[in-house]
């Protein structure tokens, strides 16, 4: 997971709507108990911005201690600040805790840059704005870090919400979400709606803003419009899914369609960039460049080192293209699209000279470890982790930034032929999987 | 307010090698990419090169591949420069500068003198 | 590489004047162009990005214009503390290209 700083080939073959839609995801079956409606309480959980992270509030220890965690869908393990660090406000004090037990093990994560380690033990954990529930959950108390916290981030610890596959030190330690629906009768699923600010925000601003929701347990309709489109988790790690075809403003990016999951394409609410394999990075960005060619940015732009500036007010939203990212259907040859906005590849910057206009800074970027959907994607969408059946919702949110022109959106069905071609298959090594 | 401090001077041998640093402050490190310049006495600005914190990727004027290596600690909001085999031609001023659209902020500059 | 040319290395000056320094780049470079002003023992100060827009806090006699390959630094009403040398620059691609600075100095 990153923290503005994770052969033969065929064509999956993008076609024309089908004639009939999908049933409304409301409409499919029978309703599981607590799976959806209205969860008020949980609504507006979330604060922070996609730049450094959005985060809950949670409490660990009894009596209970009070963090901000970030939510990361692209690891698994609950993590949390417990010495003290420069970047944090506060850690967990487990010395405090009567409920704390040490499993006298160690844990070690590195990244590509830096790491973090820690000791771990077990815990009472709640979430004040989630469920009314308390459960016992593996913690990993950070003893040391480096380039791990961020300062200003508001945020002491991260949750991981992925699969166990790629917990450390090792899928024998059970990740919270899992704990969580194992002693509660929390149904396995959760659902996140990340708001953009689209707007640069100053210190004071971001520790007041409303930065989003995790709805825990189900889906509330009030997060989205329209309808709620699945593709299926490929397989239970990050969560993984497959990108069948690209398109920039309608136009096919016409890549072999392993190009777009080489080596994996991945949704995680942890990574602020859209970030695509190399190969598709450079003919997105071509093709970006063709269609907002009326004006000429900078080299530096596209790489995310300039930003382009306007006049408050008068950014020319239109002359960007829309893109389209077409995801496997749950029915055989189908598929559907999610589309975003420059309101959210363009992510506006503070902290700049130029105060009297409004800069943004390329949010996509290149990667060498597959597709991650960051939050520059799920900004846009309100996003169903559908543990238990397997799959990922997306739906227009409620709250993404658009203008009077256009609007993010998820369509279907598009006929898609071989799309299981799709997928890479990454040859099994012992190698850490966390190096991104 | 974003500030970029360096140290005043260097004082070094030919054949050796310095390590410049770029304390930022004020915004984020990781947010802005961290870029360097050189200046000779009584001449113009030459542009180095560039480093983004957030994944230590660099890009560089060819003319300094080999000569300067860019490098970062985030945990303190540094950026640092190292230049190698010295020789008289090193002797100038070196500043850090951060781009928002061109480089709007810019350190006091390091004083690098190369002498026997 | 682009090549960004200050034809004039000196240009004088009196305090009320109106000063224009041009500066030309060897090919298109759109409006990535920012002007700055360095007083002797000083680091550069960014006054103007995008070929025409003014920095933060730099006082409205600086003026940018121009697009493509030809830019002017204008400023009107010259007052004692402009007296400094000024670049150009190129951000459009890499390598970043300075100009070879233009020094105002009093007649």
């Known amino acids: 997971t990153q923290h503005g700083i994770r052969l033969p080939l065929r064509s999956g073959l993008g076609g024309a709507p089908l004639g009939l839609r999908l049933p409304r995801e409301t409409d499919e079956e029978p309703e599981e108990p607590g799976r959806r409606g209205s969860f008020v309480e949980m609504v507006d959980n979330l604060r922070g911005k996609s730049g450094q992270g959005y985060y809950v509030e949670m409490t660990v220890g009894s009596p209970p201690q009070t963090l901000n965690i970030l939510v990361d869908t692209g690891s698994s393990n609950f993590a949390v600040g417990a010495a003290p660090h420069p970047f944090l406000h506060r850690y967990y004090q487990r010395q405090l805790s009567s409920t704390y037990r040490d499993l006298r093990k160690g844990v070690y994560v590195p990244y590509t840059q830096g790491k973090w380690e820690g000791e771990l033990g077990t815990d009472l954990v709640s979430i004040p704005h989630g469920p009314n529930v308390t459960v016992r959950a593996n913690i990993a108390a950070i003893t040391e870090s480096d380039k791990f916290f961020i300062n200003g981030s508001n945020w002491e610890g991260i949750l991981g919400l992925a699969y166990a596959e790629i917990a450390r030190p090792d899928d024998s330690l059970e990740p919270f979400f899992d704990s969580l629906v194992k002693q509660t009768h929390v149904p396995n699923l959760f659902s996140l709606q990340l708001c953009g600010a689209g707007f640069p925000l100053n210190q004071s601003e971001v520790l007041a803003s409303v930065g989003g929701s995790m709805i825990i347990g189900g889906i509330d309709h009030s997060l989205y419009t329209g309808s709620l489109w699945y593709t299926p988790i490929r397989r239970e790690w990050y969560y993984e899914v497959i990108i069948v075809r690209v398109e920039i403003n309608g136009q096919d990016l016409k890549m072999d369609c392993k190009e777009y999951n080489y080596d994996k394409s991945i949704v995680d609410s942890g990574t602020t960039n859209l970030r695509l394999p190399k190969k598709v990075f450079e003919a997105a960005v071509k093709s970006i460049k063709a269609a907002s060619s009326t004006e000429k940015f900078p080299d530096g732009f596209w790489l995310g080192e300039q930003l382009v500036c306007w006049q408050a007010g008068t950014t020319p939203w239109n002359i960007f293209p829309v893109i389209s990212l077409y995801l496997m259907g749950e029915v055989t040859n189908q598929s559907f699209r999610i589309t975003i906005l420059p309101q959210q590849y363009l992510r506006p910057v503070e902290d700049v000279a130029t105060s009297q206009d409004d800069c943004y800074k390329f949010a996509i970027s290149q990667s060498s470890t597959g597709t991650v959907m960051g939050a520059v994607i799920m900004e846009g969408f309100y996003v169903v982790f559908d543990r238990a059946r397997k799959r990922i919702g997306f739906a227009v949110s409620a709250c993404h930034v658009h203008d009077e022109f256009r609007t993010a959106a998820v369509e279907g069905p598009f006929v898609t032929l071989d799309m299981e071609d799709c997928g890479y298959n990454i040859p099994q090594t012992d190698e850490s999987t966390l190096m991104t | 307010e974003v500030q970029l401090q360096q140290p005043g001077t260097e004082l070094v041998r030919p054949g050796t090698s310095v390590k410049l640093s770029c304390k930022a402050s004020?915004?984020?490190?990781?947010?802005?990419?961290m870029h360097w310049v050189k200046q000779r006495p009584g001449q113009g600005l030459e542009w180095i090169g560039v480093?983004?914190?957030?994944?230590?990727?660099?890009k560089f004027n060819q003319k300094f591949r080999g000569k300067a290596t860019l490098t970062v600690d985030t945990s303190s909001s540094t950026a640092y420069m190292q230049l190698s085999s010295l020789t008289s031609e090193d002797s100038a001023v070196y500043f850090c500068?951060?781009?928002?659209?061109?480089?709007?902020?810019w350190g006091q500059g390091t004083s690098v003198t190369v002498s026997s | 590489d682009i090549v960004m040319t200050q034809s004039q290395k000196f240009m004088p000056t009196s305090v009320g004047d109106r000063v224009s320094v041009t500066c030309k780049a060897s090919?298109?470079?759109?409006?990535?162009v920012a002007w700055y002003q360095q007083k002797s023992g000083q680091s550069p100060k960014a006054l103007i990005y995008?070929?025409?827009h003014r920095y933060s806090g730099v006082p409205d006699r600086f003026t940018g214009s121009g697009s493509g390959t030809d830019f002017t630094l204008t400023i009107s009403n010259v007052q004692s503390e402009d007296l400094a040398e000024y670049f150009c620059?190129?951000?459009?691609?890499?390598?970043?290209?300075f100009g070879g600075g233009t020094k105002l100095e009093i007649k």
């Open positions: 500068a951060r781009p928002t659209v061109g480089l709007d902020y």
């Open positions: 004020g915004y984020t490190f990781t947010n802005f990419w």
């Open positions: 480093i983004n914190p957030s994944d230590t990727y660099t």
């Open positions: 090919q298109n470079v759109g409006s990535n």
């Open positions: 995008s070929a025409s």
């Open positions: 620059q190129q951000y459009n691609s890499y390598p970043y290209t």
